[in-house]
């Protein structure tokens, strides 16, 4: 028996369902009574789901997994993972035993888009050219960790005096806070871009300082 899985990682959004594809080529006359299918976490060997002795033994993984029972006899051993969480990320092994056995691993990459950044300024009044200001760009509930880029109004990257921190919440999603310290010119626009490296999703925020008032 030969097991085949996707070479590329499966990318799944948090709280959506994901399908980890796995297939084998059944011999003529194959029946489900001959099939023994085990899905497990590759690294820890934790059992995720199994089909043995002719029947679905069910989910061993927080009751969020399912096979495609009607497709098994055709060689479709794929696993459905419901309501994906950050902690589901990793490698899954699909093991098929009929007369002989084979296995292959498929990677699950979890992702969540970052929110549109909010911009804050400190101080936020009585600003004069030459003042040092702190601009904070905050974006929430993304995964994995973001890449943050700052640019001025002419699109020139600002790399000095940038401090970025990322904190995971209880669901494993990241809140990103990036702080730019800059000396004000006569006027200017400062924009921050928060990029999700997996989704290739960019979230933009900007602040324009033209004396008073400020525009965000």
């Amino acid at each position: 028996v030969e097991v085949q899985v996707s070479e590329d990682p499966v990318v799944a959004l948090v709280d959506t369902d994901a399908t980890l594809r796995c297939s084998f080529s059944p011999e003529p006359g194959f029946s489900l009574a001959q099939l023994n299918l085990i899905w497990q976490l590759t690294d820890t060997k934790q059992l995720v789901h199994s089909f043995t002795e002719g029947r679905d033994q069910g989910s061993a993984y927080s009751n969020r997994t399912a096979l495609f029972p009607d497709l098994l006899v055709q060689g479709n051993a794929s696993l459905r993972l419901q309501r994906v969480r950050v902690t589901d990320e990793g490698s899954y092994t699909c093991f098929v035993s009929i007369q002989d056995f084979d296995s292959a691993a498929v990677s699950l990459q979890v992702a969540a888009p970052y929110s549109k950044p909010s911009m804050t300024l400190e101080p936020n009044k009585d600003l004069r050219p030459g003042n040092m200001v702190t601009i904070t760009c905050s974006s929430y509930q993304g995964y994995p960790e973001a890449e943050v880029f700052w640019k001025d109004g002419q699109g020139v990257p600002l790399t000095g005096n940038v401090t970025t921190s990322q904190m995971a919440n209880e669901r494993g999603l990241f809140d990103v806070h990036s702080v730019l310290r800059v000396v004000l010119g006569a006027n200017g626009t400062y924009s921050c871009l928060v990029r999700n490296p997996v989704l290739q999703q960019d979230a933009h925020g900007s602040v324009t300082i033209t004396g008073q008032p400020l525009t965000f």
């Epitope: 028996v1 001959q34 023994n36 085990i38 497990q40 060997k45 043995t52 002795e53 092994t93 093991f95 035993s97 009929i98 007369q99 002989d100 056995f101 084979d102 296995s103």
Partner: antibody, heavy 119, light 109 residues
């Protein structure tokens, strides 16, 4: 060239335990099923249990259930068989054997390890 | 649990003769039956798998047949190096397990 090299002969006291190792070379260790088979002097072959390293799942013959533990260390391509509560009847040559890729059937065998249980 | 019964326990033959060894299973094992040869002081050697397939490097004088519960190993013309003990073995698919027969000793008459 597939080779299974087992640890050396052991003399044990009744009630003690023995752990026999089997180092594999040639092929990807995880992809093969490892069996342990023993043979008492002048007797036939007796399957004790086996393991598929990629799964980390071992299973045992009913006769040895609770007394034998089979493990595999992928990092060193080594399988282990530990037998506890030894008695005189456990005196035997212990073999590890490996199937071909994806096969349970043993077609490569170690040289055997003689375990003697004597007071 | 499947029991494999081999007969005869001992077979006394001369070089050049035909050897016929029998293995009977207590219930059907389909064609998941193998034959091994073992010489004194050596590990077993796989001869036949899946009832009738010769393992790599096994001479054509060895052949296997049968399915279900009755199996036969035939050595068409015994060579001096063929005098040994022969074991049949079945395997269960899940959980994977093996069972050996009691063995047949082929000795020089």
């Amino acid at each position: 060239q597939v080779q299974l090299v087992q640890s050396g002969a052991e003399v044990k006291k009744p009630g003690s335990s023995v752990k026999v190792s089997c180092k594999a070379s040639g092929g990807t260790f995880s992809s093969y099923a490892i069996s342990w088979v023993r043979q008492a002097p002048g007797q036939g072959l007796e399957w004790m249990g086996g393991i598929i390293p990629i799964l980390g799942i071992a299973n045992y013959a009913q006769k040895f259930q609770g007394r034998v533990t089979i493990t595999a260390d992928k990092s060193t391509s080594t399988a282990y068989m530990e037998l506890s509560s030894l008695r005189a009847e456990d005196t035997a040559v212990y073999y590890c054997a490996r199937g071909g890729s994806g096969r349970y059937l043993p077609d490569y065998w170690g040289q055997g390890t003689l375990v003697t249980v004597s007071a | 649990e499947i029991v494999l019964t081999q007969s005869p326990a001992t077979l006394s033959l001369s070089p050049g003769e035909r050897a016929t060894l029998s293995c009977r299973a207590s219930q059907s094992v389909s064609s998941y039956l193998a034959w091994y040869q073992q010489k004194p002081g050596q590990a077993p050697r796989l001869l036949i798998y899946d009832a009738s397939n010769r393992a790599t490097g096994i001479p054509a004088r060895f052949s296997g047949s049968g399915s279900g519960t009755d199996f036969t190993l035939t050595i068409s013309s015994l060579e001096p190096e063929d005098f040994a003990v022969y074991y049949c073995q079945q395997r269960s698919n899940w959980p994977p397990s093996l069972t050996f027969g009691g063995g047949t000793k082929v000795e020089i008459k």
